[in-house]
Each structure stands twice: as C-alpha cells, then as structure tokens.
C-alpha cells in the first residue's frame, strides 16, 4: 500500500527499507509473462551476483508486480553500493538496473501504537506512540496531521506539522507565572480561573507542537472539541535517507472543555488545603478531581491518576448568584496542581472540564481585609487597613470601591502596592458605602481577590470654614 509513496522515484526498479535491516525491491510489468521469466540479481562490490527470490502479484488493469524481499539480514548492508539488475531469463536480457545505498531508501512503517489524551492545559493534546523499529527512532523525524472531527463536515481544516524533536514540553514553564512587573499592581491576573478561552483555531497552522522521543504535545486546540490525528515518520536525512512513510491509522480524541466555562476557581487560605468551586449546572451532577505533578521536562505521568476532591455542601449565598459546587483537598507546595471537573447530565453523559494547572502559591486567597476610617475634614477621609498577611505585605494589592447611597454604580480605586492606607475626597453632607478587598500579586505569591469587606457606612460632615 506504500508504493504510492515512492511515486516520485523515477527508477523502474523501486526499493525501500523499513528498518535499514531489511530491503524490498519491486517493479511492474505490464506484459504478462510466465513464472521464472524474470530474475532479480544483486551484488555488492567485488562479490558474486546472487538472485533474490521473487514473488508476483497481479495488478488490476495493469499487469504484474514483481517483488523481492531480501531473504537474509546479512545481505542488507548500509553505506555500501548495492548493484541490482532485473534480467529476463528467457530472453537473456537485462530489463533494468540501478545502484543504490540501503541507507538512502528508508520508508519507515508508521508508528504502531498511538495514544492521545487531553494534556495538562485546556486545549492541549498529549500524544504518545511506539516506534515499530525502536533502534532507528533516533534517526527519524515525525510529522503529525490532525483536524477537528466534525461528522457534519468531513472536509474540516487539516493541520500538518513537523514535530520538533529538539524542543521539550512547554509544561516546563511554570504554569501561568505571569510577570507582574509590567502590569499595574492590581491588573487582572493571568490565573487559571480567569483565562479566557484560547482563540487559536486548528485551521491555522499556529498550534504549538513539541516532542520527546515517542511523545509530543499540541496546544492551541479548541477545548471540548473532538479531533482525529495521524502520525508518520521519515529518515532524518542526516544519518539515514529516504521518504515519508505512510500515515498511521487515524485515532480520535475528545478534548476536555475549559473549566473557565464553569467559572472554576481554586484557592488556598493556608498553603496546605485547596478549595475549588464552580457553578453548578442545571439538571446535572458534578465531581471534582485533582492530581499533583512534578516540574520536569517531558511528562512521565502521561496517564495521571486523578484523585477525588472531597465534596463540600453546596452553597447558595444569594438568589442572584449561581449555585456553586465546592470541594477541597490537601496539597503540596512542591508540585503543580491539576484540576478536572466532570459534569454528568441527566441522560448519563459525562462532560470533562480541565482547569489550567497552577502551583499552590499562585492560588493564595487572602482573608477579607478590615477597613478603618476617620474624617479629617468635611468629605476628607483617612483610610487605614491591616495587611491580612504580614508575611506578604509587599505583594498585596488592594481595591477600594465606594458608592453614594441610592446609587448602583461603584467607583473603584487601586492604592499603590503594599500601601496600608490612603485618603479619599468625598462630597460633604453625603452618605457613602465603602468596601475593600485584597489580593496577592507578587513574584512569590499570587491568588484571587478576597471577598469584599462588609460595607462600611460613611456620612460626611457639613462643610466648615477654616
């Protein structure tokens, strides 16, 4: 079936090697001829010619294909010229001949086992395969082709990408360790629970791809979508030469959705226990899972064991807010935390949603800060608050919001990073509500906003002349 891959080979006598320890040669004859008419002879320099045993197969609408598989591994030698010629024994004529090097006619068999599953990030796909001839895998390069599996559109976009074996897994980067230096102190954090869905579409050849031996990671796919994928290999052209082998049989994989869609938020209050919460779906039950992974080059735990995240009672603090499911688990500070939420709908269909991985120190939620105030002069307030965490005072940023009585819109202020207070100019003879919240956003610790402090009611004094 791989013969078509040799179409560009203009030689009438075509030869290929699967593992560089074997050699198959074949040629086609349009004209029917009895068995024994042809002989394929071969010889290495200064050696006696030998005949390669021929088999033949009928080719519909063409004639006969004559095939020889070299019978002995010792007859297949690299880096020596091999002289081959086809002889019409009956007519005692040479029909065709060629000289080749076995090391330049590789046509590798496709990877024999290919497994695919969601990676550690939403929109990521982890692929691993087994090389039929492991001893030559170092001398091969791989190409992946994949596309969205859309039953309605069988001609969906296809991406073909060369796998860069020299690149290791992107999981090396600390997950979402966004530098806070070039942001305002309280800029929206690039935290797992606030990441917007990726816009990279598989129809664009922009998806990142990395590999290590028999595995690679694709990113930039659409979370929640189904994909098909195939793999093939080619000699690297440096040590060994040849052509691209055939594509492996397609495998399909369903990527987990992005847990952003469920409003997943995880946090720790004590750097030991992690709580995760997500919006409860209508007419569905849900369950959280987690696992820890070490920071390393390419993932060894390609098939992680997800542990149950212990369920908490469902909360419904207000009718306006959606009902949340919560669960908690004990964590460690030396590993990356991965979260998966499984939602089971009434008919029993299970949908998986993957959170973006994070370190525990990236999910520290501060206690609600206490806000104190005093009016220095009419409408002029002096505000003060205690750092909820003295150990991270320089990494804590705050947001203060206030609104006039009867108003719905809030004005939000962001004091400088690490500030313990500030002043606020309000209108005299007015009533206000003030709230404060805190968040870690430094090089060591990050996390989500705390809840807003209870509203502090302020009534500013009448103006007085100095």
């Amino acid at each position: 079936q791989d013969v078509s891959l040799l179409a560009s080979d203009s030689e009438p006598l075509k030869c290929f090697s699967r593992t560089f320890e074997d050699l198959t040669c074949f040629w086609d004859e349009e004209e029917a001829a009895p068995s024994g008419t042809y002989q394929l002879l071969y010889a290495y320099p200064r050696e006696k010619p030998r005949a390669c045993p021929l088999s033949s197969q009928s080719m519909p609408h063409f004639g006969t294909r004559y095939v020889c598989q070299f019978p002995d591994q010792e007859e297949v030698r690299l880096f020596f010229p091999l002289h081959l010629w086809v002889k019409n024994v009956f007519l005692n004529q040479t029909r065709t001949q060629r000289v080749l090097f076995v090391d330049s006619v590789g046509l590798p068999a496709p990877p024999s086992i290919i497994k695919a599953m969601g990676g550690s990030q939403p929109g990521e796909l982890q692929i691993s395969w087994e090389e039929p001839a492991p001893e030559i895998s170092d001398f091969l390069r791989y190409e992946l082709r994949y596309g969205p599996r859309d039953p309605k559109n069988s001609t969906g976009p296809t991406v073909i990408q060369l796998i860069a074996t020299e690149t290791c897994c992107p999981a090396l980067q600390r997950p979402h360790s966004a530098s806070a230096l070039d942001q305002s102190p309280c800029a929206q954090p690039t935290m797992p629970w606030q990441d917007g869905p990726k816009q990279t579409s598989p129809s664009r050849e922009a998806s990142a791809l990395t590999a290590e031996g028999g595995s690679c990671l694709i990113s930039g796919l659409q979370p929640g979508n189904s994909y098909w994928l195939q793999l093939r290999s080619e000699p690297d052209g440096i040590s060994l030469g040849g052509s691209w082998g055939s594509w492996s049989l397609p495998v399909t994989v369903d990527l987990p959705g992005d847990a952003v869609a469920l409003g997943l938020q995880c946090f720790t209050l004590d750097l030991k226990n992690v709580t995760c919460q997500w919006q409860q779906q209508d007419h569905a039950s849900s369950q959280g899972f987690f696992y820890h992974s070490r920071a390393r080059c390419c993932p060894r735990d390609r098939y992680p064991i997800w542990e149950n995240c212990e369920e908490e009672e469902k909360t419904n603090p207000g009718l306006q807010t959606p009902q949340f499911s919560r669960c908690h688990f004990k964590s460690r500070n030396d590993s990356i935390i991965h979260i998966l939420v499984e939602v089971t709908t009434a008919p029993g269909t299970v949908h998986s949603y993957l959170g973006s991985p994070f370190w525990i120190h990236q999910a520290v939620r501060l206690p609600t800060p206490n806000l104190h105030w005093r009016e220095i002069s009419s409408g002029h307030l002096e505000l003060e608050w205690q750092h909820p965490s003295s150990w991270a005072a320089q990494e804590t940023c705050y947001q203060l919001r206030y609104t006039g009585e009867g108003h719905q819109d809030w004005k939000v202020l962001e004091p400088p990073l690490g500030a313990r207070g500030g002043t606020l100019e309000l209108r005299p003879r007015s009533r206000y509500r003030l709230q404060l919240r805190a968040r870690l956003n430094g090089p060591t610790y990050q996390g989500p906003w705390s809840s807003w402090s209870d509203p502090t009611r302020v009534e500013t004094a009448t103006e007085t002349a100095w």
Partner: antibody, heavy 120, light 106 residues
Framework: EVQLVESGGGLVQPKGSLKLSCAAS????????MNWVRQAPGKGLEWIAH??????????YYADSVKDRFSISRDASENILFLQMNNLKTEDTAMYYC???????????WGQGTSVTVSS | QIVLTQSPAIMSASPGEKVTISCSAS?????MYWYQQKPGSSPKPWIY???NLASGVPARFSGSGSGTSYSLTISNMEAEDAAAYYC?????????FGGGTKLEVK
C-alpha cells in the same frame, strides 16, 4: 471472452509470399505479447515468432528456421497480429496458430489456426 | 537451445489404467508446461508450472518433476483423455516443445 481468429492461409508456390492475420478481441491487446506457432501435418508444435507488448516497444524475436524470411507485426489500433511470410519453402507447410502469451502459461489462448500449403 | 524429448511417442491405455508421460530436457529448466491437443483442434493449456492444473482439467491429471526430468500422470485413464500431449519449456530462449505423445484408448 478472449478470442483469436486467424485468416490469410492458403496455397502458395515455393519462394512465394503470404500474409497471415489474427484478429484479437476480449482482452487488452496492446498489453500482451503475442506469438505465432506452427504445426506441420502429423508433427509436433514449433514456435516461430514472438512480438512483445507496447510497453516493451513491440520488440520481435524469431526462430532460426524463419529468421530473415518471416516478419511479425501488430496493428495496435485495430488489435490485429500479422505474420508476413516471404521466400516460402515446402517445409513451411503447416497449420499456423496465433497465440497469446499469458502469466500462468507461456501460451494461454490459441486461435483455431489457419492452414498454409507451400507447393508447386 | 533446449531440446525436449517426450516418451513414449505413442501409447495406448485402458480405461482406469494409470498413465505416465515423460519429458526430458537437454539442460535444467525451472518449470515444465503441458498442453493437450485433440485431432482437428488447437492445443489447450493443461498443466502449468510443472504441477498446477489449468481450469477445467480433471483432478486425475497431475504433473511433477524438476531439473531435466518431468512427467504428466493420469491416475485412471478415461476415454476422453485420448489426445496428444506436448511439454514446453519457457526457461530459456527460444521456447521449445517436446515432440508430443499420442495417447490412445484401448
């Protein structure tokens, strides 16, 4: 169904000429090698001429007994095989068969034959 | 060229009898081919590649041999088997036929 129908035989004087034809049907004529085989009365079979397929440039081969006197050719568009016989001898008297070369048999389909008599 | 010698040239056998026709080559050949010819008809392909029966050939026929010695055998002769049998080599140019064996029914 493969069919080979010879024609053109008859009585001819020694040193005379005759052209035999063989109309082929039921197969892809140009992809097969073709032969002429003859059988003298009461004798065995003798191969006399061979012409290869189009992919082998219609190369021709002859038995020593007819070389330089007989010529095999084919009309690729009309699916006809010819045998031009010149300088005929009495020993050329025989039944002449048009035969297709096959994969299992060197000669897998035979025509019904056409009779050639060389006599003065 | 390779000369094929068939023996016997003529033979007769009774129905049910075992018949063997030999074909000897002047030099070694890979395969032998056999054809059957009845009076007034053109030859029919009968056995290919030494031992394979052509389509429609009764199973009482068999072929064997190697190198320079080949044979066609009829395990139990039937009246319809009366015919001339020719061996053919296609090992080296030119192809040659044996002189034929005429088989008659007693």
């Amino acid at each position: 169904e493969v069919q080979l129908v010879e024609s053109g035989g008859g009585l001819v004087q020694p040193k005379g000429s005759l052209k035999l034809s063989c109309a082929a049907s039921g197969f892809s004529f140009n992809t097969y090698a073709m032969n002429w085989v003859r059988q003298a009365p009461g004798k065995g079979l003798e191969w006399i001429a061979h012409i290869r397929s189009k992919s082998n440039n219609f190369a021709t081969y002859y038995a020593d007994s007819v070389k330089d006197r007989f010529s095999i050719s084919r009309d690729a568009s009309e699916n006809i095989l010819f045998l031009q016989m010149n300088n005929l001898k009495t020993e050329d008297t025989a039944m002449y068969y048009c035969v297709r070369q096959g994969g299992d048999f060197p000669m897998d389909y035979w025509g019904q034959g056409t009779s050639v008599t060389v006599s003065s | 060229q390779i000369v094929l010698t068939q023996s016997p040239a003529i033979m007769s056998a009774s129905p049910g009898e075992k018949v063997t026709i030999s074909c000897s080559a002047s030099s070694s050949v890979s395969y032998m081919y056999w054809y059957q010819q009845k009076p007034g008809s053109s030859p029919k392909p009968w056995i290919y590649r030494t031992s394979n029966l052509a389509s429609g050939v009764p199973a009482r026929f068999s072929g064997s041999g190697s190198g320079t010695s080949y044979s066609l055998t009829i395990s139990n002769m039937e009246a319809e088997d009366a015919a001339a049998y020719y061996c053919q080599q296609y090992h080296s140019y030119p192809t040659t036929f044996g002189g034929g064996t005429k088989l008659e029914v007693k």
